[in-house]
């Protein structure tokens, strides 16, 4: 049965998933999908990493931790009730049937109090993404917008604005973890 995680409407949800790379920088492809883990890969993919980088992601889904050290926990920004359900974290360890699959159940609760409206930075506008797609017609790389001028301080500030650190800290120790090598 799936491990259950909770978040309130409007919060960022945190779904923990970890592995220990065999050596620093020796990364393993990981995918996150909405729905239980199927036989191969992930269904309804929301985010992927390869041996080097995040190579596909969709709006509101991102990795907050240091995925180069094996923290592939998923953050879902500004959740709604529709985000409830099972999510698959799949760590695609090379070899014969070596994949590690974790099904995590996200339960979204209505917000207790409607907060006063606050101006939020648009994360996806600040980070237009390059989607490297597999087998998706002749144009296999789609560039959505161009990267704006943005410095490391801005990136760090933006990440801090979007991070729900209390929830992350609470759940980190209960996440799915696998050691490789």
């Amino acid at each position: 049965s799936e491990v259950e995680y909770r978040a309130e409407v409007g919060q960022n949800a945190y779904l923990p998933c970890f592995y220990t790379p065999a050596a620093p920088g020796n990364l393993v492809p990981v995918c996150w999908g909405k729905g239980a883990c199927p036989v191969f890969e992930c269904g309804n993919v929301v985010l992927r990493t390869d041996e080097r980088d995040v190579n596909y992601w969709t709006s509101r889904y991102w990795l907050n931790g240091d995925f180069r050290k094996g923290d592939v926990s998923l953050t879902i920004e500004n959740v709604t009730l529709a985000d409830s359900g099972i999510y698959c974290c799949r760590i695609q360890i090379p070899g014969i049937m070596n994949d590690e699959k974790f099904n995590l159940k996200l339960v979204i609760k209505p917000a207790k109090v409607t907060p006063a409206p606050t101006r939020q930075r648009d994360f996806t506008a600040a980070f237009p993404r390059m989607l490297t797609t597999r087998g998706h017609g002749p144009a296999e790389t789609q560039t959505l917008g161009s990267l704006p001028d943005i410095n490391l301080t801005q990136i760090s500030t933006l990440a801090n604005e979007l991070r729900d650190s209390r929830l992350a800290n609470d759940l980190r120790d209960s996440g799915a973890t696998i050691r490789i090598g």
Epitope: P38, V39, F40, G43, V45, G95, T133, R134, G135
Partner: antibody, heavy 123, light 107 residues
């Protein structure tokens, strides 16, 4: 046009070996999971093995993984199935199939199939 | 292993009939179900994936439904070219498994 053409089938004695090939064309081979499925005469379909894009991850029917090896050569656009210690019950038409894929889905079903190659194991 | 049971194993029908083939999984497979059509001497053809999504180029008279353990493939008005064998396949659990097939024949 997507094409998958199997070869390498034939008559082999029990205990013998065969290597099947599947030549792919009309698509970017290295972007797709590939799979072998077999069908014994007059019977249904049975999954045999699958391999991921770069060949680093392989998946087998448990009862076959000690005797069968799936591999691929992305430079040549060829999928292979090495079959050792063949038995009469391995007699079947062997199909190679492409795992359906687009960037938000998973390759767990097969959108193109080859015509199949018949493997007969008999003394 | 997840067992897939199709019914009926064979079915006689006429052109224009509405027919439904069912597939039952031995455990919950969510919507991870595919339907294929296979004509004698030919390779299988993808019809429906994820239980209800019609594959490209498949006529709209075909439809899939169901989730969990119970699934069905419906052909709303049979055409002569639809007489064939039909297989369901689950892609939730390893190994991938197929139903035993349903033979759709002309009455």
């Amino acid at each position: 046009e997507v094409q998958l053409v199997e070869s390498g089938g034939g008559l082999v004695k029990p205990g013998g070996s065969l290597r099947l090939s599947c030549a792919a064309s009309g698509f970017t081979f290295s972007d797709y999971y590939m799979t072998w499925v077999r069908q014994a005469p007059g019977k249904g379909l049975e999954w045999v093995a699958s391999i991921n894009y770069d060949g680093r991850n392989t998946y087998y029917l448990d009862s076959l993984k000690s005797r069968f090896t799936i591999s691929r050569d992305n430079a040549k656009n060829i999928l292979y199935l090495q079959m050792n210690s063949l038995r009469a019950e391995d007699t079947a038409v062997y199909y190679c199939a492409r795992g359906y894929y687009y960037y938000g889905s998973s390759p767990n079903y097969f959108d193109y199939w080859g015509q199949g190659t018949l493997v007969t194991v008999s003394s | 292993d997840i067992q897939m049971t199709q019914s009926p194993s064979s079915l006689s029908a006429s052109v224009g009939d509405r027919v439904t083939i069912t597939c039952r999984a031995s455990e919950n497979i969510y919507s991870y179900l595919t339907w294929y059509q296979q004509k004698p001497g030919k390779s299988p053809k993808l019809l429906v994936y994820n239980a209800k999504t019609l594959a490209e180029g498949v006529p709209s008279r075909f439809s899939g439904s169901g989730s969990g353990t119970q699934f069905s493939l419906t052909i709303s008005s049979l055409q002569p070219e639809d007489f064939a064998n039909y297989y369901c396949q689950q892609h939730y659990g390893t190994p991938l498994t197929f139903g035993q097939g349903t033979k759709l024949e002309i009455k």
